[in-house]
């Protein structure tokens, strides 16, 4: 019957024996033998390995492509990849931030419910009755109609979701 060999979490089974994995920031250059331990080598600049591994090559650091609206958020190290984010006014279109899209402004009649972030687009909502937004904006919320009554004025023109009410002097009763 074949032996069942169990290696520790920082080892791997190779040709029937447990070899040490290479630590993050390094790569394997030679498997262990009965006479020699695993040989590892540090990753070169511009490369990384994030986990204990037996990989022969380190991974290339990611390039944050400016033509795609990307910029470096966090520089890569020997143990971690470069983290990209989007330039001002743009947000990532995926979890890994592979591409960017312009923030969407809320059009007239809609107000900003949540402003855009690095990873999310603007959240807009229609202005409810009694509120309006008269411009495309990345940050303006719906504003309440002016209360003509409070100003002792009367409504000359009703408000809409896109326009404020127009107040005027009350016409004197004859």
């Amino acid at each position: 019957l074949g032996q069942c060999v169990t290696c520790s979490d920082k080892q791997y089974l190779h040709d029937g024996q447990c070899c040490d994995l290479c630590q993050p920031g390094s790569r394997l250059t030679s498997h262990c033998t009965a006479l020699e331990k695993t040989q590892c080598h540090p990753c070169d600049s511009g490369e990384f390995s994030a986990q204990w591994n037996r990989e022969i090559r380190c991974h290339q650091h990611r390039h944050c492509e400016p033509n795609q609206g990307l910029r470096v958020k966090k520089e890569g190290t020997a143990e971690s990849d470069t983290v990209c984010t989007c330039k001002e006014g743009q947000h990532c279109t995926s979890k890994d931030c592979e591409a960017c899209a312009q923030h969407t402004p809320c059009i007239p009649g809609f107000g900003v419910m949540e402003m855009a972030t690095e990873t999310t687009d603007t959240v807009c909502h229609p202005c409810p009755v009694g509120f309006f937004s008269n411009q495309s904006s990345l940050f303006e919320k719906c504003y309440p109609w002016t209360s003509c009554e409070d100003k002792n004025l009367e409504v000359l023109q009703k408000g809409t979701s896109q326009t404020n009410v127009i107040c005027g002097l009350k016409s004197r009763m004859r």
Partner: antibody, heavy 116, light 106 residues
Framework: EVQLVESDGGLVQPGRSLKLPCAAS????????MAWVRQAPTKGLEWVAS????????YYRDSVKGRFTISRDNAKSTLYLQMDSLRSEDTATYYC?????????WGQGVMVTVSS | DTVLTQSPALAVSPGERVTISCRAS??????MHWYQQKPGQQPKLLIY???HLESGVPARFSGSGSGTDFTLTIDPVEADDTATYYC?????????FGGGTKLELK
């Protein structure tokens, strides 16, 4: 005893395709990266492509990228090199090799001649 | 690409000591390896990681060096050592081989 045996070489016209298999025995195939290295007639050695243990990562020299595909079948202990859009400069003896950062075992090689 | 430069040919007498050099265009740390290839045969690994002797290779073969300058030494040379010797680096992508040094015995 470790053995690597390449086959299916031969004469092929430019622009055509050829698939080279390499049968491995005498070791746990999935425990090793594998590679193809070629040697043009009377010339030196040239690394062509490598593949990781489970085939999830592949690496190619620039001159064959997009034309050659390295793959493996661990259940059959076989390495493959699919060569498409062949050119005269691909004429060489192709060796399959077992490797870490060096090639510790090589096949006997198979000759591929690209000529019209 | 990292270019590895080897002298093309050497001729020595059996029993002598011979050194075959390999110079890299960029530093390759100690990721340099040596192979022997006899006519009509596949290459055979002799030395790995600059100075480690491969199992089954006679102790007449030894390797040294780091960075850009490496040496394969055969001491003493035997008639059976007639072959071409190649160095190979695995520090920079793509992995490259030297042009080979043909060793002939007088």
């Amino acid at each position: 005893e470790v053995q690597l045996v390449e086959s299916d070489g031969g004469l092929v016209q430019p622009g055509r395709s050829l698939k080279l298999p390499c049968a491995a025995s005498g070791f746990t195939f999935s425990d090793y990266y594998m590679a193809w290295v070629r040697q043009a007639p009377t010339k030196g050695l040239e690394w062509v492509a490598s593949i990781s243990y489970d085939g999830s990562s592949t690496y190619y020299r620039d001159s064959v990228k997009g034309r050659f595909t390295i793959s493996r079948d661990n259940a059959k202990s076989t390495l493959y090199l699919q060569m498409d859009s062949l050119r005269s400069e691909d004429t060489a003896t192709y060796y399959c090799g077992r490797h870490s950062s060096y090639f510790d075992y090589w096949g006997q090689g198979v000759m591929v001649t690209v000529s019209s | 690409d990292t270019v590895l430069t080897q002298s093309p040919a050497l001729a020595v007498s059996p029993g002598e000591r011979v050194t075959i050099s390999c110079r890299a265009s960029d530093s390759v740390s100690t990721l340099m390896h040596w192979y022997q290839q006899k006519p009509g045969q596949q290459p055979k690994l002799l030395i790995y990681l600059a100075s480690h002797l491969e199992s089954g290779v006679p102790a007449r073969f030894s390797g040294s060096g780091s960075g850009t300058d490496f040496t394969l030494t055969i001491d003493p040379v035997e008639a059976d050592d007639t072959a071409t010797y190649y160095c190979q680096q695995s520090w920079n992508d793509p992995w490259t081989f030297g042009g080979g040094t043909k060793l002939e015995l007088k």
